[in-house]
C-alpha cells in the first residue's frame, strides 16, 4: 500500500469560448481508494479555488461553466490525489481559453452536382459554422477544411478552404459513389470532429477533366 | 483567353516599399482565389502569399509576414502585393497565380522582377 | 521545420521513362493534403502539370501522370521528349505552417 501516483492533466477543451473542460489521468492508486480534487488560481490572483462541476465532463474531469469561465484570464490549475498514505499532485497547467477552442463540426453539409451548359461540370459543396459559435461578435474566426473520396477509395483527398463556406471541385470520376466531409477550426485551437459524411452519385457522363 | 499582367516590379534599396499589380482579363477575376510566387534569381518557387474570393481571409509565409500585404479589387480585376521594408532576400521576380478548386495555381502571369540593392 | 523535398536533378534518354518524387511529412502530403506538379521551361512562367495528385490539365500529354502514397508524390513522364527538359516542382498545402510548400524543384535533362 503506498501513496498515490502522480496525476496529470492531459487535455482541456472549449467548444466556443464561453465553457471549458479539463481531464486527468489518475497515476497509479497505491492499492487504496484514492480521491482527486482539482484547484486552480487565475494569473495574478492567489486565492485557490475548487473545481466547481466533476460531473459534466464525465470522469476525471473539472467542467467550467459560463460562470466561472473568463477568456481574458489565464488559468493555473493542478490535481491532487489522496489516500490513506498520502498525497500527490499533478504539474501546474496553464490554460488559456482562447486557445483551447474545439468546435463542434459544421452543419448542414450539402452537395450538388452542377452541370452547367456553358462551362465545366462541377461538385458544389455547402455548410454552416456550428451553432454553438457567434461569428458576428468578432471574437472568432472559423477556417474549414474538406476532405472527399470515393466510396471504395483508401484515402481521403483534403482541402483547405480557409473562411469559406463553400467550395467548388471540378474533376472527379464519372459514375463514382463519393463520401465528402468538413470540419472547423478557430484560428488559434483545434479542429472539430469531421461531419458526418454525405454521399453524392458523380453522374456516368460527367466531364472528368478540365 | 486567361490573361495576367504583372507590373510594379524595380529597382529599390532595402528598407524600400514597392506595390505590385496585377491586371487580369479573359475571365471572372471575382471567382477565384488568388497567390503570388516569387522565384530568387538561380532559385525554386517560393509561396510568397494567397488571399480568398472574398478578400477577407489571407494567408503569408513566415518570411514576408507583417511586411507584405496582398489585397484584390473585383471592380478593377486587379490583384495586389504591397510589399515594405524590404530587404536584399526578396530580390525574385513575383509570379501572379490564379487559384482554382484546390487552390491549384492553373494560369501564371509571365512575372515582374524586384530588385533589392543599396 | 516543413519541407518538401525533392532530387536535384533528373535525366533520361529520348523515349525514356522517368520519375520524379517530393517527399512530405505528416503536416502537408501525409496529412491528406493533394499535390500539385508544376513544369517551368527554361525562361518562361511555370505552368501547371498535374493536380490533385493525379489530374492533368486539358492540353497536357497523357505521357506526365501523378501518383501519391503516405508521405510521398510522384511525378512520372514516360516516351521522354526533348521538349520536357524543364524544371519539375511539386506543391502542397502545409497545416502547420498555414501556407503553401514548394519542393526544391528538380531539373530534368534530356540527354
Known amino acids: 500500500q503506498l501513496p498515490p501516483g502522480k496525476p496529470e492533466i492531459f487535455k482541456c477543451r472549449s467548444p466556443n469560448k464561453e465553457t471549458f473542460t479539463c481531464w486527468w489521468r489518475p497515476g497509479t492508486d497505491g492499492g487504496l481508494p484514492t480521491n482527486y480534487s482539482l484547484t486552480y488560481h487565475r494569473e495574478g490572483e492567489t486565492l485557490m479555488h475548487e473545481c466547481p462541476d466533476y460531473i459534466t465532463g464525465g470522469p476525471n474531469s473539472c467542467h467550467f461553466g459560463k460562470q466561472y469561465t473568463s477568456m481574458w484570464r489565464t488559468y493555473i490549475m493542478m490535481v491532487n490525489a489522496t489516500n490513506q498514505m498520502g498525497s500527490s499532485f499533478s504539474d501546474e497547467l496553464y490554460v488559456d481559453v482562447t486557445y483551447i477552442v474545439q468546435p463542434d463540426p459544421p452543419l448542414e453539409l450539402a452537395v450538388e452536382v452542377k452541370q452547367p451548359e456553358d462551362r465545366k461540370p462541377y461538385l458544389w459543396i455547402k455548410w454552416s459554422p456550428p451553432t454553438l459559435i457567434d461569428l458576428k461578435t468578432g471574437w472568432f474566426t472559423l477556417l474549414y477544411e474538406i476532405r472527399l473520396k470515393p466510396e471504395k477509395a483508401a484515402e481521403w483527398e483534403i482541402h483547405f478552404a480557409g473562411q469559406q463556406t463553400e467550395f467548388k471541385i471540378l474533376s472527379l470520376h464519372p459514375g463514382q459513389k463519393y463520401l465528402v466531409q468538413v470540419r472547423c477550426k478557430p484560428d488559434h485551437g483545434y479542429w472539430s470532429a469531421w461531419s458526418p459524411a454525405t454521399f453524392i452519385q458523380i453522374p456516368s457522363d460527367f466531364t472528368m477533366n478540365d | 483567353e486567361v490573361q495576367l499582367l504583372e507590373s510594379g516590379g524595380g529597382l529599390v534599396q532595402p528598407g524600400g516599399s514597392l506595390r505590385l499589380s496585377c491586371a487580369a482579363s479573359g475571365f471572372t477575376f471575382s471567382s477565384y482565389w488568388w497567390h503570388w510566387v516569387r522565384q530568387a534569381p538561380g532559385k525554386g518557387l517560393e509561396w510568397v502569399s494567397d488571399?480568398?474570393?472574398?478578400?477577407?481571409?489571407?494567408n503569408y509565409a513566415d518570411s514576408v509576414k507583417g511586411r507584405f500585404t496582398i489585397s484584390r479589387d473585383n471592380s478593377k480585376n486587379t490583384l495586389y502585393l504591397q510589399m515594405n521594408s524590404l530587404r536584399a532576400e526578396d530580390t525574385a521576380v513575383y509570379y501572379c497565380?490564379?487559384?482554382?478548386?484546390?487552390?491549384?495555381?492553373?494560369?501564371w502571369g509571365q512575372g515582374t522582377l524586384v530588385t533589392v540593392t543599396s | 521545420q516543413s519541407v518538401l523535398t525533392q532530387p536535384p536533378s533528373a535525366s533520361g534518354t529520348p523515349g525514356q521513362r522517368v520519375t520524379i518524387s517530393c517527399t512530405g511529412s505528416s503536416s502537408n502530403i501525409g496529412y491528406g493534403y493533394v499535390v500539385h506538379w508544376y513544369q517551368q521551361l527554361p525562361g518562361t512562367a511555370p505552368k501547371l502539370l498535374i493536380y490533385?495528385?493525379?489530374w492533368r490539365p486539358s492540353g497536357v500529354p497523357d505521357r506526365f501522370s501523378g501518383s501519391k502514397s503516405g508521405t510521398s508524390a510522384s511525378l512520372a513522364i514516360s516516351g521522354l521528349r526533348s521538349e520536357d527538359e524543364a524544371d519539375y516542382y511539386c506543391a502542397a498545402w502545409d497545416d502547420s505552417l498555414n501556407g503553401w510548400l514548394f519542393g526544391g524543384g528538380t531539373k530534368l535533362t534530356v540527354l
Open positions: 490533385r495528385n493525379n
Open positions: 497565380a490564379r487559384g482554382l478548386d484546390a487552390r491549384r495555381m492553373d494560369y
Open positions: 488571399i480568398a474570393r472574398a478578400s477577407s481571409y489571407t
